[in-house]
């Protein structure tokens, strides 16, 4: 059965936008004016996972690209990567766990917790132009809060 998806952009709580940095990495930086067109548009799919009033499992694909954010162990550390998939098979309702994030809404802000690695979150650095990564701490230096902007299909 088809999976429900919507198109959106994400900004961290410091209003940094997410853009491509090479073929398999995202970075966060402040954009304005026409540069806003550089920000990546996600296709957010609603998938199998733990669901409650404030927690919704999603997969984050890059719109019109066969790339998904995924969480894997690299050198024994949970790591965020962009993974290439077969577009014939994705998105699907029951995604592999490494692609699944628990979208958690708290005070009008969103967190994206890895389903594969609980308590690890999509994170950005305070510094400009740094990679988006998977962080194991909340409320510290690194930013784990985001806002979502809907993009028309």
């Amino acid at each position: 059965a088809p999976v429900r998806s919507l198109n959106c952009t994400l900004r961290d709580s410091q209003q940094k936008s997410l853009v491509m940095s090479g073929p398999y990495e995202l970075k966060a930086l402040h954009l304005q004016g026409q540069d806003m067109e550089q920000q990546v548009v996600f296709s957010m799919s609603f998938v199998q996972g733990e669901e409650s009033n404030d927690k919704i499992p999603v997969a984050l694909g890059l719109k019109e690209k066969n790339l998904y954010l995924s969480c894997v162990l690299k050198d024994d550390k949970p790591t965020l990567q962009l993974e290439s998939v077969d577009p014939k098979n994705y998105p699907k309702k029951k995604m592999e766990k490494r692609f699944v994030f628990n979208k958690i809404e708290i005070n009008n802000k969103l967190e994206f917790e890895s389903a594969q690695f609980p308590n690890w979150y999509i994170s950005t650095s305070q510094a400009e132009n740094m990679p988006v990564f998977l962080g194991g701490t909340k409320g510290g230096q690194d930013i784990t809060d985001f806002t979502m902007q809907f993009v028309s299909s």
Partner: antibody, heavy 114, light 102 residues
Framework: QVQLQQWGAGLLKPSETLSLTCAVY????????WSWIRQPPGKGLEWIGE???????NYNPSLKSRVTISVDTSKNQFSLKLSSVTAADTAVYYC?????????????WGQGTL | QSVLTQPPSVSVSPGQTASITCSGD??????AFWYQQKPGQSPVLVIY???KRPSGIPERFSGSNSGNTATLTISGTQALDEADYYC?????????FGGGTK
Amino acid sequence: QVQLQQWGAGLLKPSETLSLTCAVYGGSFSDYYWSWIRQPPGKGLEWIGEIDHSGSTNYNPSLKSRVTISVDTSKNQFSLKLSSVTAADTAVYYCARASPSSGWTLDYWGQGTL
Amino acid sequence: QSVLTQPPSVSVSPGQTASITCSGDKLGDKFAFWYQQKPGQSPVLVIYLDNKRPSGIPERFSGSNSGNTATLTISGTQALDEADYYCYAWADTYEVFGGGTK
């Protein structure tokens, strides 16, 4: 409380079509997936397929050529048809609900029909 | 077809811990679910999404899933836990049950 009540013809001759219906009482029909599972006597469970309220289906590849699952949202019912039955299709057939709150797995089951 | 493999039976004395395994290729990258079925009854969900318990299921039931193996653990087993247990996961677009463990 959700209840799934199922019925259909019990005894069939080889090559006939098995037809079962499951009625859903209580709870929203459109927010879930609806599945059929079977269990041959003394054996394990086999997933047959699922449908959502819009009529979109997934089937077990081993049965796909013989199975049709349909839905009637006006009656909160869904149905299973299995064509060209043989003795190997002898089983208890269960209908079940797949719920988002349990990770889209089967959390309510019917009583089973042999 | 995708296969989930369970031991046919697991035997423990009351009060001991029972562990039932379910193995399948890269099972840890999928969500695993466990059902309990008693004779003449419909299956009952006891663990979902690897390690979560539905309301009404006792705390002695727990689950884990990593690598190629999901495990259902029943600690402090009771006579009423005697049943068949089935693991359940998905493969591409369809669902798969393990063969069951008595």
